[in-house]
C-alpha cells in the first residue's frame, strides 16, 4: 500500500485522524518538507530577540538581536552587547584595542596588525585601533632607482601612544 502521507506537500501535515488527509499547518507552525506527520511550532522572537524573518507555513521564523546587540550561538540563541569599532568586549565592558591591535567590527576581539616585514613588504598605511595596516611594496622596490608616488609611512602612528 502506498503511503498517502508522502503526497502531502510542505506547509501541510498528514492527518491520521482524518484518513491521512493533508491538512494545512495550524497557525504558528510550519513544515519545511513534504510527507510530515506533524508541523513544528515556530521559533518565537521576543525579549532581547527581534524577528528577522516571519514564520510561514513552510519555513521557520528567524531571530536577530535588538539594537545594540548581536547574535551568538546556534540560530541566534543569545545576544551579546555590541562595542564600537576599535574596541573589544571584556568582563568589565567595552575596552579600546591596545596599541598594535585593531578591531574593524562591533563584535569580536582586537587582533594584531599585520606584520608587513614577514612578507618582505613595508607599511604603506599605518594601522589604527579600527583598521589593520596596509602593506605596500617591499623596501627593495622603493630603492632610489624605482619610481614611487609616496614614500613609505612610518611604522608607528604619530601621537598614538600605547593604552
Amino acid at each position: 500500500l502506498q503511503d498517502l502521507c508522502s503526497n502531502c506537500p510542505a506547509g501541510t501535515f498528514c492527518d491520521n485522524n482524518r484518513s491521512q488527509i493533508c491538512s494545512p499547518c495550524p497557525p504558528n507552525s510550519f513544515s519545511s518538507a513534504g510527507g510530515q506527520r506533524t508541523c513544528d511550532i515556530c521559533r518565537q522572537c521576543k525579549g532581547v530577540f527581534k524577528t528577522r524573518k516571519e514564520c510561514s507555513s513552510t519555513s521557520n521564523a528567524e531571530c536577530d538581536c535588538i539594537s545594540g546587540y548581536h547574535c551568538l550561538g546556534a540560530e541566534c540563541s543569545m545576544c551579546e552587547q555590541d562595542c564600537k569599532q576599535g574596541q573589544e568586549l571584556t568582563k568589565k565592558g567595552c575596552k579600546d584595542c591596545c596599541f598594535g591591535t585593531f578591531n574593524d567590527q562591533k563584535r569580536g576581539i582586537c587582533r594584531p596588525w599585520t606584520n608587513c616585514s614577514l612578507d618582505g613588504k613595508s607599511v604603506l598605511v599605518n594601522g589604527t585601533k579600527e583598521r589593520d595596516v596596509v602593506c605596500g611594496p617591499s623596501p627593495a622596490d622603493l630603492s632610489p632607482g624605482a619610481s614611487s608616488a609616496t614614500p613609505p609611512a612610518p611604522a608607528r602612528e604619530p601621537g598614538h601612544s600605547p593604552q
Epitope: 521559533r43 530577540f49 535588538i66 540560530e75 540563541s77 545576544c79
Partner: antibody
Framework: QITLKESGPTLVKPTQTLTLTCTFS??????????VNWIRQPPGEALEWLAL???????YYSPSLKSRLTITKDTSKNQVVLTMTNMDPVDTATYYC????????????????WGQGTLVTVSS | DIQMTQSPSSLSASVGDRVTITCRAS??????LNWYQQKPGKAPKLLIY???SLQSGVPSRFSGSGSGTDFTLTISSLQPEDFATYYC?????????FGQGTKVEIK
C-alpha cells in the same frame, strides 16, 4: 546585584482572586530587553510557567490559564503584579517571579535570578 | 506546546561519581535549552543556558551539551552540595516548558 521578592496572601478561598506582587531591585523594567516572569510549583511537582511582561508592555500568558491571568507592571515602583481569578485547590503552589533579559553584556530567554517564592494555599 | 521529557526521574549516586541527565524535546528547539538546579525549599538556580554555556559562578564540573531534540547535563564529579533536583527548560517558543525534573539522591 539583581534581587526579586514575591509577596501576597498565603491563604485564599476557592473562587477568590489571587493578587501577587513581585518587587525587584538591581534592574529597571524600562530597560530594553528586560522582562519579568511568573512561574509556579505545586508541592512535590514540577515547574509551570504562567506569564511574562516585558519593558515595552508586551505580555505573554500560559495558554491553559490565559483566561484567568493578568500581568501588569509599575516601572516607577519596580513592581510586577500577577492576578489569578477563580482560584481552586489545585492552584496551591509556590509562586516565583524571575528576571529575564540582559545581565552584564549577555542576554537571552532564560530565567535568572529567581525570587525566593511565596507559598499560596487554596482552601476553604 | 513543546513537551520536555527528562530521564531518569531520579537517580542515586555517590560523591565523586559522574552523573548524566538527559532531556528530550518533542520537536527541534535548536540550542534554546536551559538547565536549573533546585534544592529543597529553595528557588531554582540557573546552571546552563543556550544548551552549553555555563552561567557565571557555577562550578566547571557542570556542563551541558546537545542541540535539536536531545540534550545532556553532566556533573563530572558529584559533590555533596550537588544533591538536588535538576530541570531542563526550553526557551524556543511560548509557553516556555520545563521537564518533570530529575532528583539526584545520595547512594
Amino acid at each position: 546585584q539583581i534581587t526579586l521578592k514575591e509577596s501576597g496572601p498565603t491563604l485564599v478561598k476557592p473562587t477568590q482572586t489571587l493578587t501577587l506582587t513581585c518587587t525587584f531591585s538591581g534592574f529597571s523594567l524600562s530597560t530594553t530587553g528586560v522582562g519579568v516572569n511568573w512561574i509556579r510549583q505545586p508541592p512535590g511537582e514540577a515547574l509551570e510557567w504562567l506569564a511574562l511582561i516585558y519593558w515595552n508592555d508586551d505580555t505573554y500568558y500560559s495558554p491553559s490559564l490565559k483566561s484567568r491571568l493578568t500581568i501588569t507592571k509599575d516601572t516607577s515602583k519596580n513592581q510586577v503584579v500577577l492576578t489569578m481569578t477563580n482560584m481552586d485547590p489545585v492552584d496551591t503552589a509556590t509562586y516565583y517571579c524571575a528576571h529575564e533579559g540582559i545581565i552584564g553584556f549577555l542576554g537571552g530567554n532564560w530565567f535568572d535570578p529567581w525570587g525566593q517564592g511565596t507559598l499560596v494555599t487554596v482552601s476553604s | 506546546d513543546i513537551q520536555m521529557t527528562q530521564s531518569p526521574s531520579s537517580l542515586s549516586a555517590s560523591v565523586g561519581d559522574r552523573v548524566t541527565i538527559t532531556c528530550r524535546a518533542s520537536q527541534s528547539i535548536s540550542s534554546y535549552l536551559n538547565w536549573y538546579q533546585q534544592k529543597p525549599g529553595k528557588a531554582p538556580k540557573l546552571l546552563i543556558y543556550a544548551a552549553s554555556s555555563l552561567q557565571s559562578g557555577v562550578p566547571s564540573r557542570f556542563s551541558g551539551s546537545g542541540s535539536g531534540t536531545d540534550f545532556t547535563l553532566t556533573i563530572s564529579s558529584l559533590q555533596p552540595e550537588d544533591f538536588a533536583t535538576y530541570y531542563c527548560q526550553q526557551s524556543y517558543s511560548t509557553p516556555p516548558t520545563f521537564g518533570q525534573g530529575t532528583k539526584v539522591e545520595i547512594k
